[in-house]
């Protein structure tokens, strides 16, 4: 196959029985009803056709039922994220049934074998759900399957095979290898539940993508573009883990999806919002901060059900740790004249001053290039709630910070040695808050002074018209 981990094997080769030795007493797929937050507590094991454990362990037929489905494992034991997720679900939904699907014997295999086992595990879950449906008061609509990595596709199979439609599937960074571009019934897909929401945290367009890149749900959320997660760089990992390795970076980014979901359960008062956008680059430009027509949503557990005709790709920025919430701002800067720009793009920074707090100095990422006589849009985000914005400081960085810029400046000087001062003219900055959907225009403090040059700053204050409100719904108003 031209790509690593190319799906191999034929329909007739798949025996649909566990790869683990058939002499084992322990079944290959076990359903562990967690009756306590304590990971040491054994809970109860449920099996199809045996009603006694349901009674003994007070299975609540009318409550929500969560099935947590792990993925491929190198260790063969439950990882710490699973216990955190169980605990968070118990905290948030006190009456709910939390079932851990233990398919460790089938997941602790070569990756390709574990992939080939996903169908049989999904089928086992579907059989359990079909059996539970025979009980009075049990409703598939109350079932929420939460699958991590390979477990997300297991959840997809379960939703596919069950008689009826499960309420919700959440895919936490669904596995990429052997699923990228797979048939709709061979991976998690929107058809597998009434609502399928997905978090993608380890996608790569180069090299091997551990998480699936393509959208597979009704809403697919790509925090930080779905690739490089803050706090997961090699430096961060080396700092926090003795002998940190690339493996730890992979784990950090892939597992970040789980922690974002846990965050949405335990930090309900600090919800993170994602915004619909066609791609990551447009989001980085700040173009996509609208909440009109269901274009924004809470991420994780609090996500509002959306069943669009077409899949919805959504983006957001996050902090490096819990709570992950940040505050997004769209900044529209109209550059109405340009002087002696040369080859090199300016490096701008902004500082936002608000009624609650002031931001740090924030870089304006130039995704393409600064256009003159045009409105240039940027995305900035802050970790703290600034409150209502009062003023903005725009700074044009002076001495070049990179060797590349220094070289370009040197070349620019050689071609135009008497290059007079570079200058931009900016009269106003329009700001829109993603979280409140409020729009505000800032004007230069001195209407006569609108020029900015390297090493200089320009101050903007709220224009006289104050906050301009549009008929756009604020995501915070719509919290469940």
């Amino acid at each position: 196959s031209p790509v690593p981990f190319g799906p191999e094997g034929r329909l007739e080769d798949k025996l649909h029985k566990p790869k683990a030795t058939q002499t084992e007493v322990k079944p290959s797929v076990r359903f562990n009803l967690r009756t306590s937050k304590d990971p040491e507590h054994e809970g109860c094991y449920l099996s199809v056709g045996h009603s006694q454990p349901l009674e003994d362990c007070s299975f609540n037929m009318t409550a929500k039922t969560f099935f947590i489905i792990h993925g491929w494992t190198m260790s063969g034991i439950f990882e710490n994220w699973l216990h955190k997720l169980v605990s968070a679900l118990h905290t948030r939904e006190k009456d709910a049934n939390v079932v851990v699907v233990d398919w460790l014997p089938l997941a602790h295999q070569l990756y390709t074998d574990a992939v080939n086992n996903t169908r049989v595990v999904g089928h086992s879950i579907a059989r359990m759900l079909d059996w539970l449906q025979e009980k009075d008061d049990f409703s598939l609509g109350n079932v929420h399957l939460i699958g991590y990595s390979l477990g997300a596709h297991v959840a997809g199979y379960a939703g596919n095979f069950v008689k009826g439609t499960v309420g919700r599937i959440t895919g936490l960074d669904p596995a990429g290898p052997m699923f990228e571009g797979a048939d709709i019934h061979k991976r998690l897909s929107p058809d597998d539940a009434d609502f399928v929401d997905v978090l993608h945290t380890y996608t790569r367009s180069f090299g091997l993508s551990i998480g699936i890149q393509m959208p597979v749900g009704h809403i697919d959320i790509y925090p930080n573009g779905g690739d490089f997660q803050p706090g997961c760089g090699l430096n961060d990992v080396l700092g926090s883990i003795a002998y940190g390795t690339i493996t730890e970076v992979v784990k950090c980014e892939h597992e970040r999806a789980v922690h974002l979901f846990v965050d949405s359960l335990v930090n309900q008062d600090k919800p993170s919002f994602a915004f619909q956008c066609t791609d990551s680059n447009r989001f980085k430009k700040g173009i996509c901060l609208s909440c009109r027509k269901n274009r924004c949503n809470s991420i994780g557990y609090n996500a509002k059900k959306m069943r669009n005709k077409r899949n919805s790709k959504m983006y957001l920025k996050t902090r490096a740790g819990m709570p992950f919430r940040v505050y997004h701002y769209q900044m529209k800067i109209h550059v109405f004249s340009y002087k002696n720009m040369g080859e090199i793009e300016p490096t701008f920074y902004v500082t936002l001053y608000g009624t609650n707090a002031d931001s740090q100095t924030l870089p304006l990422e130039i995704v393409e290039r600064i256009e003159q006589n045009a409105t240039n849009t940027f995305l900035v985000y802050t970790e703290e709630d600034l409150g209502d914005l009062l003023k903005i400081q725009l700074t044009w960085e002076g001495a070049s910070q990179s060797w590349y810029n220094l070289w370009k400046e040197f070349r620019s000087y050689l071609s135009q040695p008497r290059n007079p001062g570079r200058e931009l003219n900016i009269r106003r900055i329009r700001v829109k808050s993603g979280e409140t959907q409020r729009k505000l225009t800032f004007c230069t403090e001195d209407p006569e002074n609108t020029s900015i040059s390297p090493g200089r700053e320009l101050w903007f204050r709220k224009c006289r018209d104050g906050w301009r409100m549009k008929n756009e719904t604020s995501p915070t108003v719509e919290l469940p």
């Epitope: 031209p2 799906p7 329909l11 798949k14 709709i184 058809d191």
Partner: antibody, heavy 116, light 107 residues
């Protein structure tokens, strides 16, 4: 090995119904979707819909909704496709195909002729 | 529904020639595309799935590439048994849709 064996050719009058069968063997019948695809003379392939035998879930092409019904009999590992209110443009070869990586295996086809 | 536009609708080539067929999707289907071969009076056969993976037993002269909306199917050195009609199909979403087909004829 995987095999899909379809029922024989049919000649029907406009307005009638036809029911084509597809008997599967060589794999776990209940857990793979079986699609129906038709091909009018000299034309391309057209997906009509599919059924998952285990749960009897179906997906239909809206072009045929209301006219097509897909069913299954798990005891005989057979799926059926019934098309009603036949018209001359329904004259085609009807194929069943089992889906895994794609439409991995196909039946031999059943010719349905609609003629008055 | 996603439309799949295949081109050319027919082509003439000789044994040993390199042949390429393209398929364009009306919206992003990522790499969820399959290619089939159909000979007159026979059922279609799966050759390529997930845009670039060869199905079991398919000779290496058949290759697929592409992602997003543009896909290519190539036969590196045409053999006498390869004269047939080829179809692309998207398997990203329901309803599944096929391209119109490309008939590869002997020059």
């Amino acid at each position: 090995q995987v095999q899909l064996v379809q029922s024989g050719a049919e000649v029907k009058k406009p307005g009638a119904s036809v029911k084509v069968s597809c008997k599967a063997s060589g794999y776990t019948f209940t857990t793979y979707w079986i699609a129906w695809v038709r091909q009018a003379p000299g034309q391309g392939l057209e997906w009509m819909g599919e059924i998952l035998p285990g749960s009897a879930k179906t997906k239909y092409n809206k072009k045929f909704k209301g006219r097509v019904t897909m069913t299954r009999d798990t005891s005989t590992s057979t799926v059926y496709m019934e098309l009603s209110s036949l018209r001359s443009e329904d004259t085609a070869v009807y194929y069943c195909a089992v889906y895994d990586y794609g439409a991995d295996y196909w039946g031999q086809g059943t010719t349905v002729t609609v003629s008055s | 529904d996603i439309q799949m536009t295949q081109s050319p609708s027919s082509l003439s080539a000789s044994v040993g020639d390199r042949v390429s067929i393209t398929c364009k999707a009306s919206q992003d289907v990522y790499t969820a595309v399959a290619w089939y071969q159909q000979k007159p009076g026979k059922s279609p056969k799966l050759l390529i799935y997930s845009a670039s993976y060869r199905f079991t037993g398919v000779p290496s002269r058949f290759t697929g590439s592409g992602a997003g909306t543009d896909f290519t199917f190539t036969i590196s050195s045409l053999q006498p048994e390869d004269f047939a009609t080829y179809y692309c199909q998207q398997h990203y979403s329901i309803p599944r849709t096929f391209g119109g087909g490309t008939k590869v004829e002997i020059k």
